[in-house]
Amino acid sequence: LPRWRQQWSGSGTTSRFPETVLARCVKYTEVHPEMRHVDCQSVWDAFKGAFISKYPCNITEEDYQPLVKLGTQTVPCNKTLLWSRIKDLAHQFTQVQRDMFTLEDMLLGYLADDLTWCGEFNTFEINYQSCPDWRKDCSNNPVSVFWKTVSRRFAETACGVVHVMLNGSRSKIFDKNSTFGSVEVHNLQPEKVQALEAWVIHGGREDSRDLCQDPTIKELESIISKRNIRFFCKNIYRPDKFLQCVKNPEDSSCLSGI
């Protein structure tokens, strides 16, 4: 008889999850020489150990520490790019500007990007049927806790001038409840981070508003300034330029600025 399985509101674990994580790890370590020492089987074991056999609404940041330790990586100063509600464009940017890095350009972020996973209490099985939804079920689920953990670490290790890409088409350009607003902003280290520069990306072709004057940006400026980090904001009006460069990655002048 099939075991009774908890029904959650969210979609289940991504199919072929273990194989995907392992394959991504191998690919990443092949492409990034500085991570060649990483043993991908150990990485998978640590990843699995964070959520397998555990009640999926009771996951802690502590559960992910062995994985975080294995995936330790540093970004050069001035090269960290955070983002909020504009992931695809941020990734297009770092695809071209290869010396800047989002969390998903780092090993752990790369492994988990766009994946869902959870297990069940007291069984070694992965739940492919359903996983807890952050709103409807619980916030301490395996996926949410993972991103909170690695986002915190990513922000803590940033140094120099940190950039953040924000979506100017949203009603809340800066959202205190986003991962950026609730985790990363509060974990930038004032002794290491000189400044946060926000890039507000405009959507409309004819848009010529100054979105750096938006009340939510003023709120972000206030939070950052209180943490003794300087704040700058720039309006960015032509996001289609990112894709034009991505389409022609062989064009070295796209990569270097000019």
């Epitope: 750096c212 330029k241 002048s253 000019i258």
Partner: antibody, heavy 120, light 107 residues
Framework: QVQLVESGGGLVQPGGSLRLSCAAS????????MNWVRQAPGKGLEWVSG????????YYADSVKGRFTISRDNSKNTLYLQMNSLRAEDTAVYYC?????????????WGQGTLVTVSS | DIELTQPPSVSVAPGQTARISCSGD??????VYWYQQKPGQAPVLVIY???KRPSGIPERFSGSNSGNTATLTISGTQAEDEADYYC??????????FGGGTKVEIK
């Protein structure tokens, strides 16, 4: 290396038309916004028009809107400016300029310019 | 539309520092670009993104942008720096604007 060479300038009567061309080489033409910037004799720089790489987006300064048309042929690596209903105040050296990539909107490279004189 | 205001001329002794200002409403919210133009020649980009120097531009050229004013600084000016300098910004849509230009004279 990047090269931009303008052509098509000359003397034209008020109300007349002229088509400027800019031949580009040394970079992937379709990756970049391209622009026309002009400079009247003894005056400063004035942006005239810009076009995206694909080329779905075009932009015009108010002073030329409805009279000038920017276009490009990516297969020929060539930028164009069709100028109609020309006025004396359109007299200037017209420069073709390549935009900077990504978050920057300035001009990395300029041609040597072509002179347009509108006079009767 | 933003309007960029530059002083018509700046005079400086050789080896001294020349500072050219460019002012406009909330200019700090926009990237600023600086061009050098010598008589009979096309403009040359000397600073982009407020403070970045293109390859081939001497280190004596630097830029900053805060409040309502962007500044181009030429440290240890040389005779070859005598030229017109233009600031430029982009504020979306069809609002790409240049300042009126500043003539730098080496005394």
């Amino acid at each position: 290396q990047v090269q931009l060479v303008e052509s098509g300038g000359g003397l034209v009567q008020p109300g007349g038309s002229l088509r400027l061309s800019c031949a580009a080489s040394g970079f992937t033409f379709s990756s970049y916004y391209m622009n026309w910037v002009r400079q009247a004799p003894g005056k400063g720089l004035e942006w005239v028009s810009g076009i995206s790489g694909d080329p779905s987006n075009t932009y015009y300064a108010d002073s030329v809107k409805g009279r000038f048309t920017i276009s490009r042929d990516n297969s020929k690596n060539t930028l164009y400016l069709q100028m109609n209903s020309l006025r004396a105040e359109d007299t200037a050296v017209y420069y073709c300029a390549r935009d900077l990539p990504l978050v920057y909107t300035g001009f990395a490279y300029w041609g040597q310019g072509t002179l347009v004189t509108v006079s009767s | 539309d933003i309007e960029l205001t530059q002083p018509p001329s700046v005079s400086v002794a050789p080896g001294q520092t020349a500072r050219i200002s460019c002012s406009g409403d909330n200019l700090r919210h926009y990237y600023v670009y600086w061009y050098q133009q010598k008589p009979g020649q096309a403009p040359v980009l000397v600073i982009y993104g407020d403070s970045k120097r293109p390859s081939g531009i001497p280190e004596r050229f630097s830029g900053s942008n805060s409040g309502n004013t962007a500044t181009l600084t030429i440290s240890g000016t040389q005779a070859e720096d005598e030229a017109d300098y233009y600031c430029q910004t982009y504020t979306g849509g069809a609002s790409l604007v240049f300042g009126g230009g500043t003539k730098v004279e080496i005394k």
